[in-house]
């Protein structure tokens, strides 16, 4: 168990031309919170796919009016951190979601209005314990800073907060395996669940399930005295009688640094020498470019060759967002009827439909075509009675002269009213209620509700929102 | 071709309840649109009186005309109407039926009926 | 109640004209950008021009456009035609599920 934090240092307008216009006024204040989304691994889920590791909302910031005919400062920023708690073991690797919402407090009747102003999405490597991680992402023509980390809560311990401490038996000393638990060395690490048979003299786990030898024992289960023959290595005590020891595991072993960074041994653990433009414990974080990976979904990464210019991710076709971070998953709305099997192609949607029905949504059972013609495209289908046609894609009804109904599988959730646009379907949420679907409530879990409603998120690309 | 057609009486009574008919042709309530009513006073602006979702007929009206206006669907007959309680001279009006089908406009309008109210 | 103020209320333009109506909302619009500019001309319905506030509908001459988010949006033509003389209406829905529309701006030809 463990807490992740997020401490966001500044947002306001980014460098370069086409600085935005300050989101408050004299005669509409408003104030910034923040929204964070976590996901374990790096998540290739929708935008909108449950925030698996845990989400958080920030306090409301400061009041802020713009000062008439001055730029778009930095804002006004909520104090404190978001702290987004975890119950099992940190996963290492994560995706990030980071929203900024508008509060505005005129005179609206039912209490404040909320807009999103930017959404900015990541996937990052980070080992809890370690130092924060400082983190620069543009939204549009917004850039934010911010810096985040991992913590593990007591008793657990460990770059997955997968270890426990516990008080020392002892006055002096530690168990064989364990060390002292940094930074409470009056405590030691509780040993693991190891490998069953794991030597508890000579053998220890840092990972349930697991047997790893000390200095001068091998095999499976550490039972195995180290063969001393031709002495070579340069770890463990040696002579002619008795040979060499194997090495044990080395913190290095296996390069922790990522990006290039080299590794250099420390008394306690180890140390990234990072290359230009990467910083963190091993070397995980660079400001937002290319070299960081910021496209999901096998997207292609344009620009952003250093830290000060932006990047544009250009999806696959079934991705969109600024991040590629959002499946277009369109068969969650289950469109295919009477009983047929969805096929989400990326470039087109495909129902494969059980015998006896036909049409772009298997919406139609096989009947004679009479004669009669079919609507924007469809083609008439023969059967065993009156006509059917089977409609081009986005049409239906008995001469595909309706449009098919992509609201039917009643995809806005909370109450929301979804309407079935030419464009696809839009939500528009109930008051206290956001999000694409409307699935996010505005106020933090166990709050009261809110009086009055945020917008909706659209479903398209999140810049389009900036 | 998808249309609005607006019908009613042309001359209501004051004190009298207006009933209009909007009668659609070319799509379905199936799918899921605002259906609303706008009313223009002579030589004034448009406003907008109320809308029904036909999600779940949900409906809500401007803050003036709730408890006078009701807006209902016969979706057998592919229409909805629009009562106006207690008409006073300051309800004649152009009355339109309007379809909105996401992002917040209405992309289609019927052609409009004029209504007056008069003894 | 949401109010929605166009000005101005009216104006004279020549042909070729860069002509600019303004549209302020008492109450952010839902989703920063659902709202909408309509031209109507004596005895016709309302025909939509833009929706979501810079959208340009189909159909609709290129020198219409629109921008803004929030509470405050503006309507351009850039080079007005005869054609144009009308009265234009903005038009915006709001949280709640509530629309409102504003008080319209005649656009005349000098």
């Known amino acids: 168990a463990g807490v992740f934090e997020l401490q966001i240092h500044s947002f306001g307008p980014g460098p370069g031309p086409g600085a935005p216009r300050s989101p408050c006024s004299a005669r509409l204040p408003c104030r910034l919170f923040f929204r964070v989304c976590l996901k374990p691994g790096l998540s290739e889920e929708a935008a909108e796919s449950p925030c698996a590791l845990g989400a958080a909302l920030s306090a409301r910031g400061p009041v802020y009016t713009e000062q008439p005919g001055a730029p778009a400062p930095d804002l006004p920023l909520p104090d404190g951190l978001l702290q987004v708690p975890f119950r099992d073991a940190w996963p290492g690797t994560f995706s990030f979601i980071i929203e900024t919402w508008r509060e505005e407090l005129g005179d609206q009747i039912g209490g404040p209005a909320w807009s999103l102003l930017a959404r900015v999405a990541g996937r990052r490597r980070l080992a809890a314990g370690g130092p924060w991680a400082r983190d620069i992402q543009r939204a549009g023509a917004w850039e934010l800073r911010f810096s985040y980390r991992a913590r593990c809560e007591p008793p657990a311990v460990g770059t997955a907060c997968t270890r426990l401490c516990r008080p020392r038996s002892a006055p002096s000393r530690c168990g064989p395996g364990l060390r002292p638990c940094a930074p409470l060395e009056d405590e030691c690490e509780a040993p693991l669940v190891c490998r069953a048979g794991c030597s508890p003299e000579h053998g220890f786990c840092e990972q349930p399930g697991e047997c790893r030898c000390l200095e001068g024992w091998t095999g499976p289960l550490c039972t195995v005295p180290v063969s001393t023959s031709s002495c070579l290595s340069p770890r463990g005590p040696s002579s002619a009688t008795t040979g060499c020891l194997v090495p044990g595991p080395g913190p290095c072993d296996g390069n922790p640094c990522a990006n290039g960074g080299s590794c250099s041994e420390t008394p306690r653990s180890f140390e990234c020498t990072c290359p230009r433009g990467f910083y963190g414990l091993r070397c995980e974080v660079s400001g937002v470019t290319c070299a960081d990976g910021p496209c999901f979904n096998g997207g292609l990464c344009v620009g952003g060759a250093d830290p000060d210019s932006a990047y544009i991710c250009h999806c696959p076709p079934g991705f969109q967002g600024s991040n590629c971070e959002k499946r277009v998953d369109r068969c969650s709305l289950q469109p295919c009827r009477n009983g047929g099997l969805c096929l989400d192609l990326g470039h087109a949607l495909r129902c494969r439909c059980r015998a006896g029905f036909a049409g772009p949504r298997c919406e139609h059972d096989l009947d004679d075509c009479a004669g009669r013609a079919c609507a924007n495209g469809g083609t008439c289908v023969e059967g065993g009675g009156a006509h059917r046609c089977s409609c081009a894609l986005g049409f239906g009804g008995r001469d595909c002269r309706e449009r098919a109904d992509p609201c039917a599988a009643r995809p806005c959730a909370h109450g929301g009213r979804c309407y079935a646009h030419f464009s696809g379907l839009v939500c528009a949420c109930a008051p206290g209620y956001m999000g694409a679907r409307c699935e996010f409530p505005v106020h933090p879990d166990g709050a009261s509700a809110l009086p009055a409603a945020p917008p909706g998120l659209r479903p398209g690309d999140p810049q389009r929102y900036l | 071709q998808v249309t609005l057609r607006e019908s009613g009486p042309a001359l209501v009574k004051p004190t009298q309840t207006l009933t209009l008919t909007c009668t659609f042709s070319?799509?379905?309530?199936?799918?899921?649109?605002?259906m609303g009513w706008v009313r223009q006073a002579p030589g004034q602006g448009l406003e907008w009186m109320g809308t029904?979702?036909?999600?779940?007929?949900?409906?809500d009206y401007a803050s003036w005309a709730k408890g006078r206006v009701t807006i209902s669907v016969d979706r057998s007959k592919n229409q909805f109407s629009l009562k106006l309680s207690s008409v006073t001279a300051a309800d004649t009006a152009v009355y339109y039926c309007?379809?909105?089908?996401?992002?917040?406009?209405?992309?289609?309008w019927g052609q409009g009926t004029l209504v007056t109210v008069s003894s | 109640d949401i109010q929605l103020t166009q000005s101005p209320s009216f104006l004279s333009a020549s042909v070729g004209d860069r002509v600019t109506i303004t549209c302020q909302s008492t109450?952010?619009?839902?989703?920063?950008?659902?709202l909408s500019w309509y031209q109507q001309k004596p005895g016709q319905p309302p025909k939509l021009l833009i929706y979501?506030?810079?959208n340009l509908e189909i159909g609709v001459p290129s020198r219409f456009s629109g921008s803004g988010s929030g509470t405050d949006f503006t309507l351009t033509i850039n080079s007005l035609e005869a054609e144009d003389a009308a009265t234009y209406y903005c038009?915006?829905?709001?949280?709640?599920?509530?629309?409102?529309f504003g008080g319209g701006t005649k656009v005349e030809i000098k």
């Open positions: 029904i979702y036909t999600g779940d007929y949900s409906t």
């Open positions: 979501q506030a810079s």
């Open positions: 109450e952010s619009v839902y989703g920063s950008d659902w």
């Open positions: 309007a379809r909105h089908t996401g992002y917040g406009y209405f992309g289609l």
């Open positions: 038009q915006g829905y709001y949280s709640g599920y509530i629309y409102a």
């Open positions: 070319g799509f379905s309530l199936s799918s899921s649109y605002d």
